[in-house]
């Protein structure tokens, strides 16, 4: 997929910022609000922000500009710059009236269905597990193979550098075609196939990508919130993987939840499968030592480990991936095309 241009976004924060710069009042208010950052630390949900009056005034002036309601896209150029603007403006929306964060990402529909030719897999043994088959599909695609090799290299070896590994993982899940990335990570394994389960759990190179000693989950979130990209991905995940009813149905489409989940890989909040024998996922952190924030910590942990929307989205995608390799499809490229159109 080509990277989305700003013009493809309904209201890109980069465009809105340029418009704002052309208006002296808006420009001054934006700069003032930006300088307020140091005096207003980003509050966690358990904290109340204390806001100087001049910052409130700057926020009030920005509320009438096109910056309010501006958005970014996960695959856009200058994404971090766009997100920086978004979170600066977000303060204007929420100052003095702290609201839950809203995802900065606008959904854009993929323009063309993605094809893959499953017939190329006949070089594999028929009884190969599906994680092996999806890995092979990635290898057979130049772009996927190149991106996967890049993170494989960065994340291997006894002295791997975690921050480099994470950056390459982020690049892979951002730039590889979505079905390749999802196939690689969300491949189904037979319940007793530990080898397959281990392959799946090792997809993100957890020995390098995840912290060697599990930090406190709230510390991890604090670290994440200090980075516009990580914060955006976490908020996007909590927006789209939030159950909306008694059965745990996702607030938006399951596909949107999965996209948000994969968007976290390579950030400080990188989740992973917890074992080789099931499809449970979790953050690599602990709530021990959370003191009076124990409840808040467990709720964050539970958003990953006990989330019916996410659990079912993963299960449904794995069922779909199983069907891809069943004999029911009339043509080897048909399956993915149908699924892509559906989303």
């Amino acid at each position: 997929d080509p990277l989305p241009t700003e013009s493809r976004l309904m209201n890109s924060c980069l465009q809105a910022r340029r418009k704002c710069q052309a208006d002296p009042t808006c420009s001054a208010a934006y700069h003032h609000l930006d300088s307020c950052t140091s005096s207003i630390s980003t509050p966690l949900p358990s904290e109340e922000p204390s806001v100087p009056a001049d910052c409130l005034e700057a926020a009030q002036q920005l509320r009438n500009s096109s910056l309010i309601g501006c958005m970014c896209h996960r695959r856009m150029k200058n994404q971090v710059a766009c997100l920086d603007i978004y979170w600066t403006v977000h303060r204007a929306r929420s100052l003095g009236n702290y609201e839950l964060d809203v995802s900065p990402y606008e959904d854009t529909v993929t323009s063309k269905p993605w094809k893959m030719n499953l017939s190329k897999l006949n070089m594999l043994k028929p009884d190969s597990d599906l994680c092996l088959k999806f890995a092979m599909l990635c290898t057979l695609n130049d772009k996927c193979d190149r991106l996967r090799k890049a993170y494989g290299e960065a994340c291997s070896g006894p002295h791997c550098q975690r921050h480099v590994c994470l950056r390459q993982l982020l690049t892979f899940f951002e730039k590889a075609a979505e079905p390749h990335a999802q196939g690689l990570l969300l491949c189904p394994c037979a319940p007793n196939d530990r080898g397959c389960g281990e392959r799946r759990r090792n997809t993100i190179a957890p020995n390098c990508a995840l912290p060697p000693v599990a930090p406190n989950c709230l510390e991890l979130r604090r670290l994440c919130f200090s980075d516009p990209l990580c914060r955006s991905r976490l908020v996007d995940f909590q927006t789209h993987c939030h159950p909306m009813d008694i059965l745990g149905t996702c607030a938006t489409e399951q596909s949107r939840c999965l996209r948000a989940y994969l968007g976290l890989i390579g950030t400080a909040m990188t989740p992973n499968f917890v074992s080789n024998v099931n499809t449970s996922v979790a953050l690599s952190c602990t709530c021990r030592g959370s003191g009076n924030l124990q409840e808040e910590c467990e709720m964050l942990e539970g958003f990953f480990s006990h989330n019916p929307c996410l659990t079912e989205a993963i299960a449904a995608k794995m069922r779909f991936h199983s069907q891809l390799f069943s004999q029911d499809w009339p043509h080897p490229t048909f399956a993915v095309m149908a699924h892509q159109n559906e989303n």
Epitope: H242, P243, D245, I246, L247, G248, N278, Q294, E295, E296, C297, E298, M299, E301, G302, F303, S305, H306, N307, P308, C309, T311, A315
Partner: antibody, heavy 123, light 107 residues
Framework: EVQLLESGGNLVQPGGSLRLSCAAS????????MTWVRQAPGKGLEWVST????????YYADSVKGRFTISRDNSRDTVFLQMNSLRAEDTAVYYC????????????????WGQGTLVTVSS | DIQMTQSPSSLSAFVGDRVTITCRAS??????LDWFQQKPGKAPKSLIY???NLQSGVPSRFGGSGSGTDFTLTINSLQPEDFVTYYC?????????FGGGTKVEIK
């Protein structure tokens, strides 16, 4: 410490009404779905009703639909069960429950329970 | 509605015995099953959540397993305080449903 305390149980005649309350403390009340479960004397547990954290979604067992109403006051950290047109078969200990913080997204999880309040419907 | 069939409905055992209680769902409930213990005149207490996870503060002699339709609660080395009633509950489908209970009695 997380606590749930039910009250309002009493002896009432068939056809009568009663309002049960469950006062919560020790947690962020509005983040959790709350559930009422009952247990007739010498019998098993039966789910009665659940309300979402915001109070916008409510769910009922067929046996009480149209007669019972669940509601909550998030400013007072309290959940209510208004019981109308009571029948002898509604006689039970009524418990209120909630999920743990870890499972707050599973509305039907019942990790924490109150001590219960007895409702007796008899003439 | 999903039927939860718990068996046996009662059992007798000695202190120190290992006992197993089973719960069968009328359809697949994944691992969305909890186990409760109830002492006479008291509220139920959660022992195991999501089929196999021990609630904090629950002794490690309690264990849960299973997925899909068949689930097991195991109590290793029964203690005097364990001779009470146990219930399973599914929360995969609405309405949530409980098993009929298993009363564990002392021999």
């Amino acid at each position: 410490e997380v606590q749930l305390l039910e009250s309002g149980g009493n002896l009432v005649q068939p056809g009568g009404s009663l309002r049960l309350s469950c006062a919560a403390s020790g947690f962020t009340f509005s983040s959790y779905a709350m559930t009422w479960v009952r247990q007739a004397p010498g019998k098993g547990l039966e789910w009665v009703s659940t309300i979402s954290g915001s109070g916008t979604s409510t769910y009922y067992a067929d046996s009480v639909k149209g007669r019972f109403t669940i509601s909550r006051d998030n400013s007072r950290d309290t959940v209510f069960l208004q019981m109308n047109s009571l029948r002898a078969e509604d006689t039970a200990v009524y418990y209120c429950s909630k999920p743990s913080a870890l499972r707050f997204l599973h509305w039907l999880a019942m990790d924490v329970w109150g001590q219960g309040t007895l409702v007796t419907v008899s003439s | 509605d999903i039927q939860m069939t718990q068996s046996p409905s009662s059992l007798s055992a000695f202190v120190g015995d290992r006992v197993t209680i089973t719960c069968r769902a009328s359809q697949d409930i994944r691992n969305y099953l909890d186990w409760f213990q109830q002492k006479p005149g008291k509220a139920p207490k959660s022992l195991i959540y999501a089929a196999s996870n021990l609630q904090s503060g629950v002794p490690s002699r309690f264990g849960g397993s299973g997925s899909g339709t068949d689930f097991t609660l195991t109590i290793n080395s029964l203690q005097p305080e364990d001779f009470v009633t146990y219930y399973c509950q599914q929360y995969n489908s609405y309405p949530p449903t409980f098993g009929g209970g298993t009363k564990v009695e002392i021999k």
